[in-house]
Interface confidence: low
């Protein structure tokens, strides 16, 4: 949950690609004003997930979740939260 | 803001070699089945995407990272 808060649009696009849902991918890419060539490129990546099946999608989703919830990322998230708290305190 | 480790993973998926990408994945999930899957996906992307496609995908990532939704 915390990871998606850090950059929700990234996880929207990633899970749309890995899920193999073209409509969902189009909707996500519209949010960042992706051009037609950019959409084509992202669909080629999506094709790889579709071709390799459900297990492949689950495994890669697991990798992304593991990286996003690793100490490398969580340490960063905690640091950012501390910085935000400092800024909020200073702003009062 | 996106976590640098995630950014690196995605960058290597597009612009790294299969070895570099798999080594990066192994730092987080060293299961043989996961690493084999990572290599298969990486090889598939390398086979399907031209250099221009990869530039376009990187451009999408730039738009994502600079989006207000990130």
């Amino acid at each position: 949950v915390k990871m998606a808060e850090t950059c929700p649009i990234f996880y929207d696009v990633f899970f749309a690609v890995a899920n193999g849902n073209e409509l969902l991918l189009d909707l996500s890419l519209t949010k960042v004003n992706a051009t037609e060539p950019e959409r084509t490129a992202m669909k080629k990546i999506q094709d790889c997930y579709v071709e390799n099946g459900l297990i492949s999608r689950v495994l890669d989703g697991l990798v992304m979740t593991t990286i996003s919830s690793s100490k490398d990322c969580m340490g960063e998230a905690v640091q950012n939260t501390v910085e935000d708290l400092k800024l909020n305190t200073l702003g009062r | 803001e996106i976590c640098p480790a995630v950014k690196r993973d995605v960058d290597l998926f597009l612009t790294g070699t299969p070895d570099e990408y798999v080594e990066q994945v192994a730092q987080y999930k060293a299961l043989p089945v996961v690493l084999e899957n990572a290599r298969i996906l990486k090889n598939c992307v390398d086979a399907k995407m031209t250099e221009e496609d990869k530039e376009n995908a990187l451009s999408v990532l730039d738009k994502i990272y600079t989006s207000p939704l990130c």
């Epitope: - | 612009t15 790294g16 070699t17 299969p18 070895d19 570099e20 080594e23 192994a26 290599r39 298969i40 990486k42 090889n43 598939c44 992307v45 390398d46 086979a47 250099e51 990869k54």
Partner: antibody, heavy 121, light 106 residues
């Protein structure tokens, strides 16, 4: 200019040991995967071993597994190949080679000039 | 282990002729395929990396194509200096060379 210079080759008896070195210059050594590749006299190229940039990932061809050890010293821009239990079929020119990267067409695979290892009694 | 099968083993060609060398991988290797040229008593020189990327300084008559399992090296209008042995190398999973193709000038 990228340069790779191998040394340490020579004549050795079967069962003996030898340590090859490769001195790298002209690029950021610690950024690249490095390989040892060999070529027996009059034969084709055979990949021997590679080591990742950090040294975390190491792989060997089945023909040398358990007998050869690859290592690197990033501080000294050096690559090594420790060879033991040498056999006549290990006789070859040994090349040190730098891997390329996908996204920069100037960063190709570079090779040294090679060092000859002869295993004979 | 990925096996690389190169063909033909030998080719005798007249100058200005077009040369085609193929390399087949036993399983998909994406675009992780490189082509080398080796002349007698010299170390191999990279011609094409990642299936189709020309390496800097390599004459434009050398080109590469293919992805997945089938790859081709093409030498358009062969020159005398192109007499050499050509090898393909896969770097998708470990490293494997093809057995080589010797190109001789008639």
């Amino acid at each position: 200019e990228v340069q790779l210079v191998e040394s340490g080759g020579g004549l050795v008896k079967p069962g003996g040991s030898l340590r090859l070195s490769c001195a790298a210059s002209g690029f950021t050594f610690s950024d690249y995967y490095m390989n040892w590749i060999r070529q027996a006299p009059g034969k084709g190229l055979e990949w021997v071993s590679y080591i990742s940039s950090s040294g975390n990932s190491i792989y060997y061809a089945d023909s040398v597994k358990g007998r050869f050890t690859i290592s690197r010293d990033n501080a000294k821009n050096s690559l090594f190949l420790q060879m033991s239990s040498l056999r006549a079929e290990d006789t070859a020119v040994y090349y040190c080679a730098r891997d390329g990267r996908y996204n920069d067409r100037r960063r190709g695979y570079y090779w040294g000039q090679g060092t000859l290892v002869t295993v004979s009694s | 282990e990925i096996v690389m099968t190169q063909s033909p083993d030998f080719q005798s060609v007249t100058p200005k002729e077009k040369v085609t060398i193929t390399c087949r991988a036993s399983q998909s290797i994406g675009s992780s395929l490189h082509w080398y040229q080796q002349k007698p008593d010299q170390s191999p020189k990279l011609l094409i990396k990642y299936a189709s990327q020309s390496f800097s300084g390599v004459p434009s008559r050398f080109s590469g194509s293919g992805s997945g399992t089938d790859f081709t090296l093409t030498i358009n209008s062969l020159e005398a200096e192109d007499a050499a042995t050509y090898y393909c190398l896969q770097s998708s999973s470990l490293r494997t060379f093809g057995q080589g193709t010797k190109v001789e000038i008639k």
